[in-house]
């Protein structure tokens, strides 16, 4: 049993770290593997996670982590019963990858302004809770040619549009994603979209 | 939100022992380490020891290691700190404190006060 | 157990920027994060700033940190009354065995 290619990681910085891996040949993840990992630190323990198969020949491990700060690092055994197949670590601050925004709403009851909110995806206590910046993307599905990115850099998650802006009459959608600058992640997810239709029109000139 | 909440003032005789509780609530007490410090009147900060509250296993500075035991008790989130033959130098507050590399809540201290 | 030197006092007058330097090794801050916490008369410490430069939530951009080799300095602008306790870096120190430590810490009189 051969590792083709090697665990990479990446975390949401709050409580999950994937690892994926290709293994040299067809392989029941669960069944003939073990991914232990430990963080280095005085009196931690050793985990062991159980793989679950992410195609004929790869594997993807869900380590759960608690308190993730940037000084951590762990390091991370890949064992076929008693033969260890790899060996590594891992620094979950410098591969992150934020939990993607939920609860996206979008307000059209606001005079000429379409007001979209969601929810940062952190608790106030988490370090990537006033460090996150977002990516709204519009778009029209009555209007192909129509697709906009708004980045949102302030830390308030809402996005202001004045209605004038967006055609009349028909339906748009939204979804938003984050970033976190000062760790440098990738970005996250998309969040569901949301639907809504702009009934908005030019007040008539006299 | 997030509490540690230790016992109250403590006066002990040297060569007798102590115990300090630090009761913590608003989170999920097996998923944070828990640190001891202490401060003598008008000094600085010196740690003790680490606890994970998960397994148990502690890590306590050379200075107290044989004097000092950590412990924790999950079904009331209780972490506790005993210090044993207890000198005059030991009179101190006492601080727990949540965090790894750092110490994000802290308690208020125990005062622990060593007196013949 | 090796300390980190701070200066004892700092004072300066309401408004103003003060700085509290942090001084240390490279079996300490040169290779580890600083954090820095205040501690305000008859109360327990608490953090201002983790890894050099990054301030929890609630703490005003008053306050900031910086780190340069193997010394640290905390930063605060605008002084206010309030801001008057004493303060303490902390590090880990990677010398067998690891462990945390501290500054010897810096009483701030707001004049």
């Known amino acids: 049993m051969k590792v083709l290619q090697e665990p990479t990681c990446v975390s949401d910085y709050m409580s999950i770290s994937t690892c994926e891996w290709k293994m040299g040949g067809p392989t029941n993840c669960s069944a003939e593997l073990r991914l232990l990992y430990q963080l280095v630190f005085q009196s931690s323990e050793t985990h062991t996670c159980v793989p679950e198969n992410n195609g004929g020949v790869g594997c993807v491990c869900h380590l759960l982590m608690d308190d993730v700060v940037s000084m951590d690092n762990y390091t991370l055994d890949l064992w076929a019963g008693q033969q260890l197949l790899w060996k590594g670590s891992f620094k979950p601050s410098e591969h992150v990858k934020p939990r993607a925004p939920g609860n996206l709403t979008v307000h059209t009851n606001v005079s000429d302004t379409v007001l979209l909110t969601w929810s940062n995806p952190y608790p106030p206590d988490n370090y990537l809770y006033n460090d996150l910046t977002y990516a709204v993307n519009i778009w029209s599905e009555n209007d192909p040619a129509y697709s906009r990115i708004h980045n949102v850099t302030y830390l308030k998650p809402t996005l202001r549009i004045p209605a004038s802006t967006l055609k009349s009459g028909i339906s748009y959608r939204a979804r938003v994603r984050a970033w976190a600058q000062h760790y440098n992640t990738t970005w996250s997810e998309w969040s569901p979209s949301t639907k809504w239709y702009n009934s908005y029109r030019e007040p008539f000139e006299q | 939100q997030v509490q540690l909440v230790q016992s109250g003032a403590e006066v002990k005789k040297p060569g007798a022992s102590v115990k300090v509780s630090c009761k913590a609530s608003?989170?999920?007490?097996?998923?944070?380490?828990m640190h001891w410090a202490r401060q003598a009147p008008g000094q600085g900060l010196e740690w003790m020891g680490i606890?994970?509250?998960?397994?148990?296993?502690?890590s306590y500075a050379q200075k107290f290691q044989g004097r000092v035991t950590m412990t924790r008790d999950t079904s009331t989130s209780t972490v506790y700190m005993e210090l044993s033959s207890l000198r005059s130098e030991d009179t101190a507050v006492y601080y727990c404190?949540?965090?790894?590399?750092?110490?994000?809540?802290w308690g208020k201290g125990t005062l622990v006060t060593v007196s013949s | 157990q090796s300390v980190l030197t701070q200066p004892p006092s700092v004072s300066a007058a309401p408004g103003q920027k003060v700085t509290i330097s942090c001084s240390g090794g490279?079996?300490?801050?040169?290779?580890?994060?600083v954090s820095w916490y205040q501690q305000l008369p008859g109360t327990a410490p608490k953090l201002l700033i983790y890894?050099?430069?990054k301030r929890p939530s609630g703490i005003p951009d008053r306050f900031s940190g910086s780190k340069s080799g193997t010394s640290a300095t905390l930063a605060i602008t605008g002084l206010q009354t309030g801001d008057e306790a004493d303060y303490y870096c902390?590090?880990?120190?990677?010398?067998?065995?690891?462990?945390?430590?501290f500054g010897t810490g810096t009483k701030l009189t707001v004049l």
């Open positions: 890894d050099n430069n």
């Open positions: 902390g590090t880990w120190d990677t010398s067998s065995p690891p462990q945390p430590i």
């Open positions: 490279s079996s300490n801050i040169g290779n580890s994060y």
């Open positions: 606890i994970n509250p998960s397994g148990g296993s502690t």
């Open positions: 404190a949540r965090g790894k590399w750092w110490w994000q809540y």
């Open positions: 608003g989170y999920a007490f097996t998923s944070y380490y």
